[in-house]
Each structure stands twice: as C-alpha cells, then as structure tokens.
C-alpha cells in the first residue's frame, strides 16, 4: 500500500487502533467536562483514549474535526488530511495540551478494545456497512463514522441496499450523511432519512466519509450500504465513465436529504 496523502495503508494498524471512538454530549458538541467525558467512556466499558491510542487510530485514517478530552486531561483531535477549516493546515494530533481547567467543555475520545464498534476505517476494495444490529432495528443515541480510504486514483461507488430511518422533514432526528472527503466537514453530499432508497453515489476521489446518527426517540429498520472500488479509467474509455458519473451525481442530489 505505501504512504499516500498522510495515510500509512497497512492493515496491521487496524488491530492496534481498533476501539478509539468519538463521543459528544447528549446536548451536542463541546458540552462535556473532563469528569463527564471520563464517566461517559467508563460507563460504556472503556476509558478516555491516551494520546498514543488516538495517534494509532489516526494513522489508519481516523479523522475527526472536533476537539475532545483524552486521558490525563489532555485535549486534541486527530487530523489525517489538512484542510483550511480544520487543523490549522497540519496533520497529526492537533494538541491543545493538558488543560488546567477540567471544567472546560469539549467532546470525548474513548478507547474500548472490546466494544462492539460501529463504523471504522475501511481500505478493502469492497465492503457492506450495516446500521448497528441490522437486520434488527438500530439503537437510540448512536453515532457511527465509516471512513473509506482506497488506493490513490481509485474512486468509490456507493449503493444503498436497504434503507429505513425515522422520517422527518429536515432529517433532524435519525440520518445518514455522506461526505466526499476525509471528514464530516468538507465535501457534503447529502443527508438522508426515511425509507426511500437513495440513488447511487460516486466519489470524486479515493476517500469518503459516512456518518450515521440516531437521536433518543423513535428507531427504525436501519440500513445496508455497499461500496465498491472503481479503478482508474483509461483515457480511451473516459468519455463513457464521465457520463455515468454525472448521471450519478444528478441522481443522488435528488435523494431524500436536506442541505445543511
């Protein structure tokens, strides 16, 4: 695999980095004191991630644009690819250091190697993502991120096999968001809910991020989303491929979502 765009593509890292995940408060972003962040991670059977654990996760593509508490009162967030709105153009753990004021409010980075994780970082050429518990209904209060990281030059063909999320006009309760980028900040494609199968989506590059969020109320059947790696197209067949892509783009924009 080698090193490309700040990611060391080596599946050995998956084992070591498994178990790091990002948590927000019930009331939203940047609402947890250190004690609360610690309690949330411990209640779920883990503990606050150490700097090393967060860095190990980052090295296999864990990228979140939200500062969170780590072990020993440290605050930071993992950046795989630098961007103008996140990470000050740097890669690595953006480190705010050990905070003297433990009452400051941030998110949390938990570590639990035994957790039934939802989401993760995927470098396989094809994979199916399922909502937690599928085919049973998903749980309330879930946040899952699936980060797809393929070989440089490949693109991602995303298709929805099953889809049933709580329906509401703005998709504010339960939703899947798709981003044509490393994170859930850039390249917003759409927010989806309800029970209509969204159209296929084709990425513009070799990375994509899916975010699933469920609130504390109604649940539904959940989803299965499949992706397949598309190899780089040769010059001779590029015309055909471009037309497929633009049709795909038109279709997914007509899907059941609201722009943020």
């Amino acid at each position: 695999w080698g090193f490309k765009d700040g990611i060391f593509h080596n599946s050995i890292w998956l084992e070591r980095a498994a178990g790091v995940y990002h948590r927000e408060a019930r009331s939203g972003k940047y609402k947890l004191t250190y004690a609360e962040a610690k309690a949330v991670c411990e209640f779920e059977g883990g503990h606050l991630a150490t700097y090393k654990q967060l860095e190990a996760a980052r090295k296999i593509g864990f990228h979140v644009c939200a500062a969170g508490w780590m072990a020993k009162g440290r605050v930071g967030y993992p950046i795989v690819k630098p961007g103008p709105n996140c990470g000050f153009g740097k890669t690595g753990i953006i480190d705010y250091g050990i905070r003297l004021n433990r009452s400051e409010r941030w998110d949390a980075y938990c570590y639990n190697p035994h957790a039934k994780e939802c989401g993760g970082v995927f470098t396989d050429p094809k994979q199916i993502f399922k909502s937690p518990g599928f085919p049973n209904e998903y749980e309330d209060n879930q946040i899952c991120y699936w980060h797809i990281r393929l070989k440089y030059g490949q693109r991602i063909h995303l298709s929805f096999l099953d889809f049933d999320l709580e329906d509401d006009p703005g998709c504010l309760a339960d939703y899947v968001e798709i981003y044509d980028s490393y994170d859930d900040v850039h390249g917003f494609v759409g927010r989806y809910c309800g029970d209509e199968l969204p159209d296929d989506i084709i990425s513009t590059g070799n990375v994509m991020t899916l975010k699933f969020l469920s609130d504390a109320s109604v649940t539904a059947g959940g989803f299965q989303i499949k992706y397949v790696a598309m190899d780089p197209v040769s010059k001779s067949s590029q015309g055909k491929n471009t037309s497929t892509t633009s049709t795909g783009n038109k279709n997914f924009l007509a899907g059941r979502f609201s722009h943020l």
């Epitope: 949330v40 749980e139 209060n141 504390a216």
Partner: antibody, heavy 118, light 113 residues
Framework: QVQLQQSGAELARPGASVKLSCKAS????????INWVKQRTGQGLEWIGE????????FYNEKFKGKATLTADRSSSTTYMELRSLTSEDAAVYFC???????????WGQGSTLTVSS | DIVMTQSPSSLSVSAGEKVTMSCKSS????????????LAWYQQKPGQPPKLLIY???TRESGVPERFTGSGSGTDFTLTISSVQAEDLAVYYC?????????FGGGTNLEIK
C-alpha cells in the same frame, strides 16, 4: 452547585392556561437537557418532555402534545412549561429535572404544585 | 412506549430485614452497542423530588449506601436493600432511559414496621 429553582404553587381555573418556570444555573442551562415530569397526588411519575436550550431541540411524550409546550429563555437561563386547556386531570406537582450525560436524571427542582379549581 | 411494571406495589418490613423489589420492562433496555442496560432506580421520600440511587441497572450513584444494590438485564431488574434502615421509608421507582418517551414504573412503597 447545580440548582433548579421552580416557580411557586399555582391556582388556575378549568380551561385556563398556566406557565411554570424552572431557573437553572447558566452552566446547566447551556449544557444539558431540561426535562419536565408530572406527579399527581399519591401517583407515580410521568415524563412530559425534554428541551435542549443550547440548540432549541425539544422532544415530547405523545400523551402531552397539545397539552404542554416547553420553551427556554437564554437571557434568564429559564425553561418554561405552558399547560393549556386545564382540567382537574392536570392538577399535580410538576418537577423539572436535568438529564445527565449518562442515562439518568441527576438533579431535580423542588416541584411546582398546580391546583385546578373553579 | 416502553411500559415499566413494578412489584410489589407496597411492602412493609422491619428494620434490618432484606428487601427485594422487581421492575419489568415491556421491551429490552439493553443497548446492543455498549451492552449497558439503560435503567435507573430512584428513591422518593414524602414531599421531596426523586433521588437517584442506581443507574445502568447496577451502578450505584456516589454517596448512596452500599446496602442498595441493583441487578438484572434486558427486561427484568431488581433493587435489593440488604438491611433496611428507618430512613429508607420511601417510594422506589424504576425508569426506562433507553428511549423516548422516558417512562417510570408505578413505584414500590416501602413501609417500616
């Protein structure tokens, strides 16, 4: 110190409306969900709804939709519950409670007693 | 909605005795993601708001005496008081915190003989 200070006892006529208040510390108001719970004399507890003042999200028990409206005033860090079209069934003690980031209510107001009588 | 059923509705015991009360939910309160049960127990004394005793079905809130123990998983839960004290006179409620609408059991009224 977390405190939820509720308004005093209210006496209202059937068919009228009443607005109960729950004043929180700024920290609690901004960072947590504020819930309302009903308890009729000698009865159990019924959850009415929850509001998140930081983002305006509000969730109701279907049973109380149309009966209760939850609002929040940022300037005073106060959450309100308005009850309309009052009947004798609405006579109860109403508690506001803060929901922790873990699955429980960790702080409660002292309760506001509503009497409905003509 | 998840229905919470408590039993018995009341019980009368002497100080020092062991007490067990039950709470059953109409749906599982186990979160499959983290394998935690989203059930809490509260104690309510006359004229006061409820006070948290146990959360996550079995985690004792800080400051709560060790004689209070919560157990159970899925749909069947138990609160045990190993040696009842006079100050334990109260109504005990279980609460579903798994999903909206949050629901409470009807309560178990503990009287001291």
């Amino acid at each position: 110190q977390v405190q939820l200070q509720q308004s005093g006892a209210e006496l209202a006529r059937p068919g009228a409306s009443v607005k109960l208040s729950c004043k929180a510390s700024d920290d609690t108001f901004i960072n947590y969900g504020i819930n309302w719970v009903k308890q009729r004399t000698g009865q159990g507890l019924e959850w009415i709804g929850e509001t998140f003042p930081s983002n305006g999200n509000t969730f109701y028990n279907e049973k109380f939709k149309g009966k209760a409206t939850l609002t929040a005033d940022r300037s005073s860090s106060t959450t309100y519950m308005e009850l309309r079209s009052l009947t004798s069934e609405d006579a109860a003690v109403y508690f506001c409670a803060r929901h922790s980031n873990l699955p429980y209510f960790d702080h409660w107001g002292q309760g506001s007693t509503l009497t409905v009588s003509s | 909605d998840i229905v919470m059923t408590q039993s018995p509705s009341s019980l009368s015991v002497s100080a020092g005795e062991k007490v067990t009360m039950s709470c059953k939910s109409s749906q599982s309160l186990l979160n499959s993601g983290n394998q935690k049960n989203y059930l809490a127990w509260y104690q309510q004394k006359p004229g006061q708001p409820p006070k948290l005793l146990i959360y996550g079905a079995s985690t004792r809130e800080s400051g709560v005496p060790e004689r209070f123990t919560g157990s159970g998983s899925g749909t069947d839960f138990t609160l045990t008081i190993s040696s009842v004290q006079a100050e334990d006179l109260a109504v005990y409620y279980c609460q579903n915190d798994h999903s909206y609408p949050f629901t409470f059991g009807g309560g178990t009224n503990l009287e001291i003989k």
